[in-house]
């Protein structure tokens, strides 16, 4: 059997670190057998059998010129084997971040914080950390570890399915190469990393007869569980074309009627989602949808009993009193008011 331990990596390759002493091992001899060492393709003897180093070749302060293939020969001239030297560095702790698009699963991605120059793989696992008792700050022994299954095709990502929203997890990503291993531990809670995908199916429609109204509607993101135990809340932004500032409102449901649109101008609308109890962060914005308020007035029909009847809108006078719409980013004066003639709802 070979006296050379096989490091993780391709067969016949041995590894060292630049600036450090490197020992190469002759694989086809018995441990301690004296051998001669040559560079592949070069007749010059690097180290003779009388070196006292047996089956090993020692390179002091290796550098890039030492990389390449070496040949070892036994005393009778037989080939003891060939060895390829590759230089690089031990692993450093990878950089890890985790994110969740729903309250049942999360994924973690990683990048090397330093390139080692050597074949590298990653081991990924997680533990669940549980708190002992409602009042206790002490933590029980963690449960696990369990593997965090990695994406196929070498993507630097693993996914934890069936996570518990109220639990804390400790993620372990270990970078491994032939010179060692280095581990990054990251504590995550689903509550803090939750970031829903943006709402889908955003539509913006005019409201016939109301030249300053637009109705926006949307749906939950497809990634949010179908029977949600946790609801989402929404934030909607809108602005007229060529206007730099967005107005922001927080709708109560899956639609919002904008009542201070600029008549005749197309408006951009976008929506964002967040857990309704403010866990995590707001989603990215949905793609913008566009709509233009209608230009006509409401048809003069006698409504059926019980229907709401509202007066048609008229353009406000500039100096008319105007309570501002609740907004996180108010418009300039021109856009900073509701319809000056409030729509009075009456029973017909």
């Amino acid at each position: 059997s070979s006296p050379c331990p096989q490091a993780w990596g391709p067969p016949g390759v041995q590894y060292g670190q630049p600036g450090r002493s490197v020992k190469l091992c002759c694989p086809g001899v018995t441990a301690g057998d004296p051998v001669s060492w040559f560079r592949d393709g070069e007749p010059k003897l690097l180290q003779g059998p009388d070196s006292g180093l047996g089956h090993e070749l020692v390179l002091a302060q290796a550098d890039s010129t030492d990389e390449g293939t070496y040949i070892c020969q036994t005393l009778d001239g037989a080939l003891g084997g060939t060895v390829t030297l590759q230089l690089g560095y031990p692993p450093a702790r990878p950089v890890v971040s985790c994110q969740a698009a729903d309250y049942e699963n999360f994924s973690c991605t990683w990048s090397p914080s330093q390139i080692s120059g050597l074949p590298t793989r990653y081991l990924t696992s997680y533990r669940k950390k549980t708190v002992l008792g409602a009042d206790s700050q002490r933590r029980s022994p963690s449960t696990g570890p369990w593997p965090c299954p990695q994406d196929p095709l070498g993507a630097a990502r693993c996914v934890v399915h069936g996570a518990e929203f109220w639990s804390q997890y400790r993620i372990n990503v270990t970078e491994v190469n032939p010179l060692g291993a280095s581990t990054r531990l990251l504590d995550v809670s689903l509550q803090s990393i939750l970031r829903p995908d943006p709402p889908q199916g955003l539509r913006v429609e005019s409201v016939p007869g109301y030249p300053r109204r637009l109705r926006a509607s949307w749906t939950y993101p497809a990634s949010w569980p179908c029977q949600p135990h946790f609801l989402l809340k929404f934030r909607l932004q809108y602005r007229p074309a060529q206007h730099p500032a967005w107005s922001t409102v927080e709708p109560a449901g899956l639609e919002e009627v904008i009542t201070d649109a600029v008549a005749g101008l197309p408006h951009a609308v976008r929506v964002s989602a967040r857990d309704f109890l403010d866990a995590g962060t707001w989603s990215t914005w949905s793609p913008e949808a566009w709509g233009t308020p209608s230009t006509g007035t409401i048809p003069k029909e006698i409504p059926a009993w019980g229907q709401l009847h509202t007066q048609p809108e008229v353009e406000p006078q500039v100096d008319s009193p105007a309570p501002p719409r609740p907004s996180l980013q108010p418009h300039p004066r021109l856009l900073d008011h509701r319809d000056s003639v409030e729509q009075v709802a009456v029973l017909a």
């Epitope: 950089v95 990048s111 330093q114």
Partner: antibody, heavy 118, light 107 residues
């Protein structure tokens, strides 16, 4: 010679923008994470932002999150810091640093002074 | 974020004195602690890494010890060229933080 050289500092008004650069030489830039650290006049050191070799992961101090963007161009051996919505409290000498294992800063530039004032 | 505290904030000592600076982390940082020296108008210089390892080229009069939350930096025999501010810094997590610094001068 192994070195880092910052540039791009100067006087800017509050709310303004500035882009700092850091030119690296003497080592394999694309193998290392890179970092910006700042020091306000007469004050201590404050880590600002770091980026992995590939550029795929970035990290920011809370004080600059959403305003500053770190980036790198490995083909030019250059690190950048785009600073927007600058405030008076961003006034500092900004150092570029090369960390080992993300946080052991074994090489520093000389720094570039950013002054935010009206 | 992990908070780092240093004491004393400044000290005066005579040439040849033994100087000790302590650094405390707000939570366990294993041994992911570095010490830097900064002279006026200059960039910081790494002296000690991972709590106790001497950076290449740094004189052996500088040393460090500790793990967990409590760390110590020592200059065994203060020299005139050691006048500087010394900072500890943790990198246990992805947001490195520095201590407030200790200014060392000669009596």
């Amino acid at each position: 010679e192994v070195q880092l050289l910052e540039s791009g500092g100067g006087l800017v008004q509050p709310g303004g923008s500035l882009r700092l650069s850091c030119a690296a030489s003497g080592f394999t830039f694309s193998w290392y994470s890179m970092t910006w650290v700042r020091q306000a006049p007469g004050k201590g050191l404050e880590w600002v932002s770091s980026i992995v070799p590939s550029g795929g992961h970035t990290q920011y101090a809370d004080s600059v999150k959403g305003r500053f963007t770190i980036s790198r161009d490995n083909s030019k051996n250059t690190l950048y810091l785009q600073m927007n919505s600058l405030r008076a409290e961003d006034t500092a000498v900004y150092y570029c640093a090369k960390p080992l294992d993300w946080g052991r800063f074994d090489l520093w530039g000389r720094g570039t002074l950013v002054t935010v004032s009206s | 974020d992990i908070q780092m505290t240093q004491s004393p904030s400044s000290l005066s000592a005579s040439v040849g004195d033994r100087v000790t600076i302590t650094c405390q982390a707000s939570q366990d940082i294993n041994n992911y602690l570095n010490w830097y020296q900064q002279k006026p108008g200059k960039a910081p210089k790494l002296l000690i890494y991972d709590a106790s390892n001497l950076q290449t080229g740094v004189p052996s009069r500088f040393s460090g010890s500790g793990s967990g939350t409590d760390f110590t930096f020592t200059i065994s025999s203060l020299q005139p060229e050691d006048i500087a501010t010394y900072y500890c810094q943790q990198y246990d997590n992805l947001s490195p933080t520095f201590g407030p610094g200790t200014k060392v001068d000669i009596k």
